[in-house]
Every structure is written in C-alpha cells, then in structure tokens.
C-alpha cells in the first residue's frame, strides 16, 4: 500500500455563457486542496448548445428548458454522480440581454426566470442566471488570461507554458470579441486614470492591480454587421444594397424589419420606400474598410486620448490576448501565427474578399453558409476595430496574440467569473503551499 | 444605488426653447434607455418620448414631433430634453426616467413655468 | 394610441380596508406572455414610484399590501389594508406600444 497515491479529493464547476449568439457549457475541475494556488483550475469540457442566443428564445421561452439539455445531461456524464450536489452552476449572460434588457426588463426577466427554473432542476448547487456588466465582462476576461497564463505566481519559471509565455510578470491586456459587445481591458503604464468608469482595482495573490477596462455593446461583430446595413442602406437610392463587404456574386434578402430591431440601429433608423432590401456583394476590402470605419466616431474626445465614440483609452501598454470571436475569426481566415504582420494581414484580407462567393463555397464546402458569407465582414471589421478603434500600429501588431486555448482552457470571461464566484483568488498570497495530492504515503 | 438628478426650475416666455438637463448615477448610462415624462398642474403623465444613450437614436410621442429633442452626454452620464416654440399649456413638471418598458427610476422634476 | 381609462376618479377607503383601482386599455397590452402594465403611486410634489410592474410583479421596497392583477385589456391594483401613508394619486402605464400611455388617475384618500 506504500506506492498507492492517495485518492485525489477533486471539485469542479459549471459556467454556462449565455452570449448573443449561442450558449456555451464549461466544466472546470481542480484539486481541492490546491483551490487557492494559481493555475490549478483547468477546463474538462466544453458543450455547445444548439440553437440561438437566450435572448432569441423571447418568444418561445417554453422552448428553453429542452434548449439546454443536452448541455446540462453531458454535465452529469462528465462530472462523478458522487460530486453532483457540491458542484456549483453559474449562468452569465452577456451582451445580447443587455440589449433586450435595454428594450424590455420584463422580456429580459421573462427569459432569466424561465432559464432559473430549467437550470434549478437539476442535480448541481444552482447559483442563479444573471446579466453581468460589460465592467465584468472585461475584468473576468482578464483575469483568465492571466491566471492561464501564470502571471499571478509568485514562482518564477525556468520554462515557458505556452510559446508567446514571457517569464516576466506582466500580465497581458484582454480583447475579447463577442456577437454584441467587445471588450478591451489591461494595465496602462500611467496608474492615474481621467475616467473612473473605466478604473478596476484588484489585489490578486498579494498584488495591486490597476486595470482600464471598457465594453462596447453594439460593437460585437454582429451588431456591427447590422449597423453598418442600417448605415448604408440609408444612402441606398433602391432596395439594392451593393456591398464591399461580401464577396462578388453573394446575395441575400434582408427585412427592414430586421435591420430595426435591435437598438444597435437605433441611430441610424429611417422610413424606407421598401420592406425588404438586397445585399450584393462587390467584394472589396478598402471600401468595407471605409465603411466600417464610419462606425467609429473619432471626432469628439472629452478626455487626452480617446478610443472612439468619446470613450477614454488609456495609451496601449505590454502584450495582448485576442481571443473568441476574434481568435475564431483570424484563426478561420489562417491570420493567427505571430509571424503575419499587420500589412500581411491586410493583403490576406483583400485577396480573400475579392474572391467570387462560388468560389469561396467550393473552397469551404464544410461551413455553414451564414457563417462562410460574413468572413470578409468580420475579417474587415477586426482589423478597423484594432488599427483605428484601439490604436494598434503595423508595430504594435505584433504585440497581439489570437489565442483560442491556453493549457487546454478557452480564454474568455467563464473562468474569471468562476474563479471570483468560488473565492478561488485569493487577495493575498498563500502563505504555505499544501501537501500535493501525488504525496506518498 | 441608482439616481437622477434634474436642473432646477426655470420660467421662459412663450415662443422660447427650454432644455432640461438629467445626470445618471449609480449604473451604466449606456445599459438602459432615458424617457421623458411631463404633468402639467392636475393633469395626468404624458410620455414624450425617450433616448438610446449608447447611439442617441431616439423615438418621440408625434404630439411633440419636431418641437422636442432628446441628447446625451455620455462621459457625463448625461440626458438632455430640450423643448421649442413653449406655449403657456407647456407649463408642467418634467421628469427623466431610466427603463426599456419599466420606469423605476425617476428624477426629481423639473417645473418649467411659461408665461 | 392605446387610451388608459382608470376608475374610479377618485376613492375614500377607511385605515385598514381594501381598496381598488380598475385599469382598462382599448387594446390588450399583452405580448409575448407579458403585460406590459404598470402602477405608480404619487404623492404631492414627488415623481411617481414604481409599484407593480408586469401587471403582477412587486416593484423593488414596495409593501406586500399594494398587488395588481389583470392581463389582456383589464387590470386592478389592490391595497388589501390602507395605511395613512397610501393618500396619493394611482396612475396605470402601459409600454406596450409608443407612445406610451398613463391613465387618469385615482386619487385615494381616508374615509
């Protein structure tokens, strides 16, 4: 019996990310006498949920109990039965109901309920569904970055984790991309900021932490989409809407009605001779540029240095992880490798969107065509949203890093959250480390 | 916690504009629309219309079409309503309002008082 | 529009007794197994409170005596036992349409 490690005492936790264009399961497990050590927390599993984004389901909330359970059975496979009563669920959801919230709290309160009641019924420790702030959107975003990345431990490493790991302990800024919103978040240079709005304090692990952070809800690459319909169908002089942002030859019918429901169009909204209108690909990169950048209101800044739409952005400072949406779209596009610079991935993006919509079907039979026809679009938008949005330069490109996974874990905000929810992170640094559970007895 | 807070009471002539200010605390100004109420002295609330603080779109009662203007601030957290062409029937206490459909917060009031 | 019409216009109830407040829209306020019916309470020189929300639901510190009831086209708001601090003015909304509408009022007082 000497040789026999001893049974590992293990906790996990489900996060459930309600975004605005579908829902995605994480389970996480960790040791559980190691819970306040850093980077012992690592993802088990990941489910998507099939179908739409919660706030789609507002006209058919009956349908929500059976939209999340295939997610939440795989949850009860994966985790030990044993474990199921003392493994916490949580369910954040994000920019999509704060767009509803923002037409209706009682549609939003509708769904929440519905969703409460369906996630309630299972065996977990059910912990409520709520809409976090774009604030905590950001700061959990980077938080798991962090944590991820071992820019919270105090142990300094001979060896790196993941390749763009560096061994110093600055941490690295967070720009996430959802459908409806995207985040940026890190420590400026300068600790004095000129918008409280945008300041986060933390203490992690015995440290102080003074963090900018800002989400732009409406700026998520679908409501951009839509914004900038809503924008040039306006100076559309039929129901024809040639568009640079989608390739030659592709068409699609879209409703007016559509276009209007969402308060991201809101600005934009005008009485139109037509119900519905056409979208005809031309296919060019410099005039989807020009369009998108029109999004960005540049000229009106309250503070010394502004992002766009008279939002403070505090001067650029370290390395940065791009991840969801942003890392999907790049990594779809073959963008992602630190060797592509920024010029490169400009040229990449105007070979890839004048290429006729056949071709671009033939090329990538396996995608969804919804999805395959809005690459160009979202390519387009995330390089405007950096270069012109944040202020990244061809030089500062290479400061940023399109990550999907870090040790096997998705970046973005779930774990961050779960991290805080659980009281995983602690203010200061653990004294002494404890036994391991690979200890011999 | 939440509040709005309302510039004070302000007396104009008939034919003047006036424009009432509403400062937000307490929860992201963006997050939520801000409506326009008045009540004129004994009579009931009159919805005039409300602003997207995110975009500034806005949606107005048509009785008031063309003489109201809603803005915003947004690094002041800000809402603005401004009112043309006052007649002595504008004489009213006007409120801002945080809510997509659920008005439960409201500022202080605002009387504007034309003669 | 979709016209409020409260009733009564006004209501005398004595301390301790119930009192209630009829609601009626020329169209059903309903949608998507919503209504989108509210209550406020006003008293002299305050803005309104939030009361009922949803036809049905408490709004936020609002006393368990104050409930409301209805869908569609009628509603009632009921005080189940009237304390000195309920004299005001009750206004019915409806957000279901723009442009938003209130109803007349109902002023209650102490018998």
């Known amino acids: 019996t000497q040789n026999k490690a001893l049974p590992e005492n293990i906790k996990y936790g489900i996060v459930l990310d309600a975004g605005s264009s579908h829902t995605s399961l994480y389970i996480y497990k960790w040791p559980a006498e190691k819970e306040n050590d850093t980077g012992v927390v690592h993802q088990v599993e990941e489910c998507r949920v099939k179908g739409p984004g919660i706030s789609k389901y507002v006209q058919k909330v009956n349908e929500i109990g059976i939209y999340l359970t295939d997610c939440m059975e795989r949850a009860r496979e994966v985790i030990p039965r044993s474990q199921h009563q003392e493994t916490p669920v949580y369910l954040g959801a994000t920019a999509g109901m704060r767009l509803l919230r923002m037409e209706s709290e009682e549609l939003a309160d509708r769904v929440l309920d519905v969703v409460e009641r369906s996630l309630s019924n299972y065996p977990f420790d059910f912990q409520g569904a709520r809409i976090i702030t774009g604030q905590e959107e950001g700061a959990y975003g980077w938080i798991t970055i962090n944590y991820l990345l071992g820019k919270f431990s105090q142990k300094t490493r001979w060896f790196s984790i993941v390749p763009y790991e560096t061994n110093n302990q600055e941490t690295f800024g967070a720009l996430d991309l959802g459908g409806a919103s995207t985040q940026i978040t890190f420590v400026p240079q300068n600790q004095t900021t000129e918008s409280p709005d945008n300041a986060l304090q933390f203490r992690l692990y015995g440290k102080d932490y003074n963090v900018y952070t800002h989400s732009f809800l409406c700026y998520g690459k679908d409501q951009a989409l839509w914004q900038k319909l809503a924008k040039d169908i306006q100076v559309a002089s039929n129901e024809i809407l040639r568009d640079p942002c989608f390739h030659p030859g592709y068409k699609k019918v879209v409703n007016v009605s559509d276009l209007y429901k969402t308060p991201c169009t809101k600005r934009f909204e005008m009485t139109l001779p037509f119900q519905q209108f056409e979208i005809q690909g031309i296919g060019n990169y410099q005039q989807c540029h020009q369009s998108v950048l029109e999004l960005f209101n540049t000229s009106y800044c309250p503070y010394s240095q502004c992002a766009f739409n008279g939002i403070f952005l505090p001067p650029l400072q370290g390395d940065f992880g791009a991840f969801s949406a942003f890392y999907f779209v790049m990594n779809f596009l073959n963008l992602t490798s630190e060797k592509v610079s920024q010029e490169k991935v400009t040229e990449m993006m105007k070979k890839f969107c004048s290429q006729p919509w056949e071709e671009i079907k033939t090329s990538y039979a396996g995608v969804k065509e919804k999805y395959l026809s809005e690459y160009c679009f979202s390519g387009t938008y995330i390089l405007s949203l950096l270069l012109q949005g944040y202020h990244f330069t061809a030089d500062s490109w290479e400061h940023i890093h399109f990550i999907g996974k870090i040790q096997g874990s998705d970046a973005g905000w779930t774990l961050g959250y779960m991290l805080n929810l659980t009281n995983m992170i602690p203010a200061e640094q653990p004294l002494s480390t404890p036994l391991s559970h690979s200890t011999y007895v | 916690q939440v509040q709005l807070v309302q510039s004070g009471a302000e007396v104009k002539k008939p034919g003047a504009s006036v424009k009432v200010s509403c400062k937000a605390s307490?929860?992201?100004?963006?997050?939520?629309?801000m409506h326009w109420v008045r009540q004129a002295p004994g009579q009931r609330l009159e919805w005039m219309g409300y602003?997207?603080?995110?975009?500034?779109?806005?949606t107005f009662n048509q009785k008031f079409k063309g003489r109201v203007t809603i803005t915003v601030d947004t690094s002041a957290s800000t809402a603005y309503m401004e009112l043309s062409s006052l007649r002595s029937e504008d004489t009213a206490v006007y409120y801002c309002?945080?809510?997509?459909?659920?008005?439960?917060?409201w500022g202080q009031g605002t009387l504007v008082t034309v003669s | 529009d979709i016209v409020m019409t409260q009733s009564p216009d006004s209501l005398a109830v004595s301390l301790g007794e119930r009192a209630t407040i009829n609601c009626r829209a020329s169209?059903?306020?309903?949608?998507?197994?919503?209504?989108?019916m509210y209550w406020f309470q006003q008293k002299p020189g305050q803005p309104p409170k939030l009361l009922i929300y949803?036809?049905?639901n408490q709004g936020s510190g609002v006393p368990d005596r104050f409930s409301g009831s209805g869908s569609g086209t009628d509603f009632t708001l009921t005080i189940s036992s009237l304390q000195a601090e309920d004299v005001a003015v009750y206004y019915c909304?409806?957000?279901?349409?723009?442009?938003?509408?209130f109803g007349g009022g109902t002023k209650v007082e102490i018998k």
């Open positions: 309002a945080r809510g997509g459909t659920r008005f439960a917060y």
């Open positions: 307490g929860y992201t100004f963006t997050d939520y629309n």
């Open positions: 602003i997207v603080p995110l975009n500034g779109g806005s």
């Open positions: 169209e059903s306020v309903d949608n998507f197994g919503v209504s989108f």
């Open positions: 949803g036809a049905s």
């Open positions: 909304q409806q957000t279901k349409e723009v442009p938003y509408t």
